[in-house]
Amino acid sequence: TPEVWVQVRMEATELSSFTIRCGFLGSGSISLVTVSWGGPNGAGGTTLAVLHPERGIRQWAPARQARWETQSSISLILEGSGASSPCANTTFCCKFASFPEGSWEACGSLPPSSDPGLSAPPTPAPILRADL
């Protein structure tokens, strides 16, 4: 069964800067990744970035740099200044559209006890399934 994992960490150098990493554990080819915050995309969440494996990457503030880390994982750095900056309990969600599995989404937030710059190893987060 495909899974999506989400890892959130606060940067030690900039305490209001976050890095979100998401990955897809499945055999299908990924056609699109959507990263949002404040809840799942389409359910109150606000889109931060949309990544297509070949067409390119679109991102919006406070996202600073979205990129593919591997063919099945992405990372997103968020700026930490201004009214739209994230806070420690912000929820981040990643939605992977894959063929033939469908669409898979998971959410995560900063671990409550985590020190800046430290985070638990990425583990599969609760998975929401919405077939394409």
């Epitope: 494996p53 390119g56 503030a61 591997t70």
Partner: antibody, heavy 114, light 113 residues
């Protein structure tokens, strides 16, 4: 079928503003950004910026910051580009586009002349 | 900003012959993580909007004839039309799809010899 339909040609005076509309159909309007690109007569393509209708998040080309405003109305699946303080060199065809420039509107000719 | 430079500025090719357009970017368009090059090619005919031909440097957009092909990596890219048809007369643009702002080449005008 994805379609982007733009408003008609405009003739404007220098110093005035113009608002161009782009009505989308055939896909989920809120999910993908609407890009705006212009092309001066006989010239190449120049990216103005983009708006993501679902959140009204925007990115602007630095060249146009402060002079251009993007808005979107999800209820009608229509995006708008307003360009102010028009000058003669803004005379161009203005295009909207979506899904990484895979789909384009037919273009709107804006002529700035006194 | 990434500067895109096309060559030649204009090109005349006989019907049925091969046409080659080059595009050079001032920075690499390769995403090392997934080894994809974020470069696109467009065709524009007079009075029409641009039409996406190629994305990801080498993937043809749906419905584009297979005589169009894209190649290259990093900073150097090529659009090839294997056998020129009369309807291919147009201006061709390459585009940086790697980073903001998306920037276009100056265009290459393709004509029939």
């Amino acid at each position: 079928e994805v379609q982007l339909v733009q408003s008609g040609a405009e003739v404007k005076k220098p110093g005035s503003s113009v608002k161009v509309s782009c009505k989308a159909s055939g896909y989920t309007f809120s999910s993908f950004s609407i890009e705006w690109v212009r092309q001066a007569p006989g010239q190449g393509l120049e990216w103005i910026g983009e708006i993501l209708p679902g959140s009204n998040s925007t990115n602007y080309n630095e060249k146009f910051k402060g002079r251009v405003t993007f808005t979107a109305d999800e209820s009608t699946s229509t995006a708008y580009m307003e360009l102010s303080s028009l000058r003669s060199e803004d005379t161009a065809v203005y295009y909207c586009s979506s899904y990484w420039f895979a789909y384009w509107g037919q273009g709107t000719l804006v002529t700035v002349s006194s | 900003d990434i500067v895109m430079t096309q060559s030649p500025d204009s090109l005349a090719v006989s019907l049925g012959e091969r046409a080659t357009i080059n595009c050079k970017s001032s920075q690499s368009l390769l995403n090392s993580g997934n080894q994809k090059n974020y470069l696109a090619w467009y065709q524009q005919k007079p009075g029409q909007p641009p039409k996406l031909l190629i994305y990801g440097a080498s993937t043809r957009e749906s419905g584009v004839p297979d005589r169009f092909s894209g190649s290259g990596s990093g900073t150097d890219f090529t659009l090839t039309i294997s056998s020129l048809q009369a309807e291919d007369v147009a201006v061709y643009y390459c585009q940086n799809a790697h980073s903001y702002p998306p920037t276009f080449g100056q265009g290459t005008k393709l004509e029939i010899k």
